[in-house]
């Protein structure tokens, strides 16, 4: 705390503001009749240095001049940038117990002269905005520095505004609050910034600009779109702009896209026709403006207009497949399946599907609409049938897709050869085949069909399928493929009026099964033992089971068990063995094997054959 200098004064030479690296002399003088006692020699003046209110040094040893008991001069050097406080105190040497008394204090500021301001940039936002300029001040001066922005222009006028930088605020931008209007488009303006502080001054180079150089139009507003005759592909984009705008840039994209469609429009006057939109698609539209064809700056992009284009009638054809099942000697059940159109084909919300089953010769027609992607009907087994399906939205229907209903696996000569299924990775399977050897009619296409081998999958789940051109002999299936699940895969070869198929099982990833089959019964028939079992529960199979193994050994024997390996067939749940001795008690069990290995053993059963077994 500095008292109001009642006891004396402190002065600084050359000044209280000095350049970095300079020294200063601080003189502390007592006022007349002030001091410790009537003996001036007992007055000792000391100088203390404070930085950020913390005492950092006693400058007792820096005295360069001393009028004993009356005044002292101290030299201070190596002052750091910023402000340093010096306090002069009076120490009465004959009374050591009393603390020194403050006399007076002074603040010395160390800094640098300002550098010439650089990179002046001026902007006016919109035709009715005001001119604001910013600049780079250069190095920090550590002193209060005043900046004057001067703008000179037509009519011999100069506009100026000031601000200052210190340790609390920075001044590198000023808004002059004056508007430049388009009638001054040809006029030249000159801007400069002057910086001044206690150690010097500097001025920027003059920067010349025109109205067009600095005015950034406001972004367009009130954006809307009008679809001509409710068209889904053609629309007129409309917006409001500032009066002087001559050039617009439009950008638009579907919401899930990553790249914009860009359009430049000259003299659009707030209107532009777009002709390449996708129906029933969420779009984002933005517009930017410019006041001059060659010069000037683009405005910021407008706020986005987000809207969905109207529907148009579906295009493209449905991908149809079917299943046939005989019910009795004169009736069959036809189940039709089809895949949903992708959005670019559906071009709207599909409301329903129109399904037709027609008997070609007798002209019998069954028609129906459904909202589902499958349809089942019972029809006579006689006659040649064809099916067609089309998709409808609010604007119309797609062209019907036709398919001939043939016996899919009825012609052995059309069955593809050497069908194989290899797991590619966790979620797909590569299926390959060779064409039928002796097909008497040309293969029009292959259909690869797959379904998880789980109970009830035929009735519960629709099949998955891929259409393959006749010259391709492989398919990578991935839709709904999960690891550790076995799929039945069929490859159909279809001609105009016939079908042949081959079947294989495959999985995308496998492990050894969790458990072995459960032996439910052992029966003796005609000198043979029949082992019956229940299959491993579906979740525990963990892939395609290649074969089962039946193990047996004499009870209490330590010898290796004998085994019989059976090719896995889903329909089979019993198997005969005939190498057991009569009236010997055996222990039997089963395991299951996938490509990854063998399961733990299933339950053990004991059995003692009675008859005369071979």
């Amino acid at each position: 705390n500095i008292d109001v200098c009642k006891l004396g004064t402190v002065t600084v030479q050359p000044a209280p503001v000095i350049p970095l690296g300079s020294a200063a002399n601080i003189s502390c003088s007592l006022n007349p009749k002030q001091g410790c006692s009537h003996y001036p020699s007992s007055n000792e003046l000391i100088l203390l240095k404070f930085v950020n209110d913390v005492l950092v040094e006693n400058l007792h040893g820096k005295k360069v001049h001393d009028h004993t008991g009356h005044s002292s001069t101290f030299q201070v050097t190596n002052l750091s940038l910023g402000m340093t406080l010096f306090v002069c105190k009076l120490n009465c040497s004959n009374s050591q117990k009393k603390p020194p008394v403050p006399v007076c204090g002074v603040e010395i500021s160390v800094g640098v002269a300002p550098e010439p301001p650089q990179n002046i940039s001026c902007v006016q936002e919109g035709e009715n905005g005001t001119v604001a300029c910013s600049w780079n001040s250069g190095k920090v001066t550590y002193l209060k520095t005043n900046y004057t922005l001067q703008l000179s222009g037509p009519n011999n006028l100069t506009c100026q505004k000031q601000c200052f930088s210190d340790n609390r605020q920075n001044c590198n931008r000023l808004d002059l609050g004056i508007n430049l209007s388009p009638d001054l488009a040809e006029s030249r303006f000159i801007v400069r910034v002057t910086a001044i502080n206690d150690l010097g001054n500097s001025s920027s180079l003059p920067h010349t600009f025109t109205f067009l150089d600095i005015v950034i139009p406001l972004p367009p507003w009130d954006i809307r779109i009008n679809f001509l005759n409710a068209s889904g592909s053609r629309g007129t984009l409309q917006w409001e702009d500032e009066g002087q705008v001559v050039l617009n840039q439009l950008r638009y994209q579907p919401l899930n896209s990553t790249s914009w469609n860009m359009v430049n429009a000259t003299n659009a006057k707030g209107k532009y026709d777009l002709r390449d939109l996708r129906p029933f698609t969420e779009y984002e539209f933005q517009i930017s403006s410019k006041l001059h064809l060659s010069g000037g700056s683009w405005s910021n992009w407008s706020e986005s207009l987000r809207t969905r284009t109207p529907e148009e009638e579906p295009v493209g054809i449905l991908d149809i497949w079917y299943m046939k099942q005989d019910i009795d000697y004169d009736r069959q059940q036809i189940s039709l399946f089809w895949k949903s159109l992708n959005p670019s084909e559906a071009r709207g919300k599909i409301l329903h599907y129109q399904v037709t089953l027609q008997e070609v010769t007798k002209k019998t027609t069954l028609q129906n609409t459904t909202r589902h992607t499958s349809w089942t009907r019972v029809i006579p087994r006689t006659g040649a049938w064809t099916a067609s399906v089309s998709a409808a939205n609010s604007k119309g229907a797609s062209a019907p897709t036709h398919i001939n209903i043939v016996d899919l696996c009825g012609t052995g000569l059309l069955a593809p050869h050497q069908v194989s299924a290899k797991s590619e990775n966790m979620d797909n399977i590569l299926v390959t085949w060779q064409p039928p050897k002796k097909a008497d009619s040309a293969v029009r296409e292959y259909i690869v069909e797959w379904r998880a081998l789980q109970p009830g999958s035929i009735t519960k789940f629709p099949p998955h399928w891929l259409r393959i051109p006749p010259d391709n002999m492989s398919a990578l299936i991935s839709e709904n493929i999960k690891p550790y699940i076995c799929y039945e895969i069929r490859v159909h070869a279809l001609s105009e009026s016939q079908g042949g198929c081959s079947s294989i099982r495959g999985d995308s990833k496998h492990k050894a099964p969790v458990s072995g089959p459960h032996i439910t019964a052992i029966t003796e028939k005609k000198e043979r033992l029949f082992i019956s079992w229940t299959h491993i529960p579906f979740p525990e199979q963990r892939g395609c089971i290649l074969h089962y193994r039946i193990y047996w050994k004499e009870r209490d024997s330590t010898a290796q068990p004998e085994l019989c390996e059976i090719q896995y067939r889903r329909s089979q749940n019993s198997h005969p063995i005939s190498s057991l001795q009569p009236r010997v008690t055996y222990v039997l069990w089963m395991t299951a094997v996938t490509a990854a290995g063998e399961s733990p053993q299933g339950n053990e059963r004991e059995f003692c054959p009675q008859g005369k077994a071979n």
Epitope: G153, P154, N155, L157, C159, Q160, K161, Q162, D175, L176, G177, I178, N179, L180, S181, D183, L184
Partner: nanobody, 123 residues
Framework: QVQLQESGGGLVQAGGSLSLSCAAS????????MGWYRQAPGKQRELVAA???????IYHDSVKGRFTISRDNADSTVWLQMNSLKPDDTAVYYC?????????????????WGKGTQVTVSS
């Protein structure tokens, strides 16, 4: 409506000083720009100096460094301190004001005007 009342004109010798004052009344709180124009006989009216409520000052190049404009935003008063006066500065000085300003409007298109006060500088 805005009324502008000037005062402080008069006769002064070359090299002397004068201070003009202008007080606005009415809807004066809306005035962003206030300033001084002058018109000498047979000449067009020209802006001498103007100031906005944000502190931006505008000077005609012929008076720069000699005249200083200042303002009290609170009571809508503007002053023009004229030093080192020259015979060429002889004119009727008008106080003017506007809600907002463009460079083009500075040429003489302000919305509100005072009646004027005569300044004569003798040689």
């Amino acid at each position: 409506q805005v009324q502008l009342q000037e005062s402080g004109g008069g006769l002064v010798q070359a090299g002397g000083s004068l201070s003009l004052s202008c007080a606005a009344s009415g809807s004066a709180f809306r005035l962003n720009f206030m300033g001084w124009y002058r018109q000498a006989p047979g000449k067009q009216r020209e802006l001498v100096a103007a100031i906005n409520s944000g502190g931006t000052e505008i000077y005609h190049d012929s008076v720069k460094g000699r005249f200083t404009i200042s303002r009290d935003n609170a009571d809508s008063t503007v002053w023009l301190q004229m030093n080192s006066l020259k015979p060429d500065d002889t004119a009727v000085y008008y106080c003017a004001a506007d809600r907002g300003i463009s460079w083009s409007k500075l040429a003489g298109g302000m919305d509100y005007w005072g009646k004027g006060t005569q300044v004569t500088v003798s040689s």
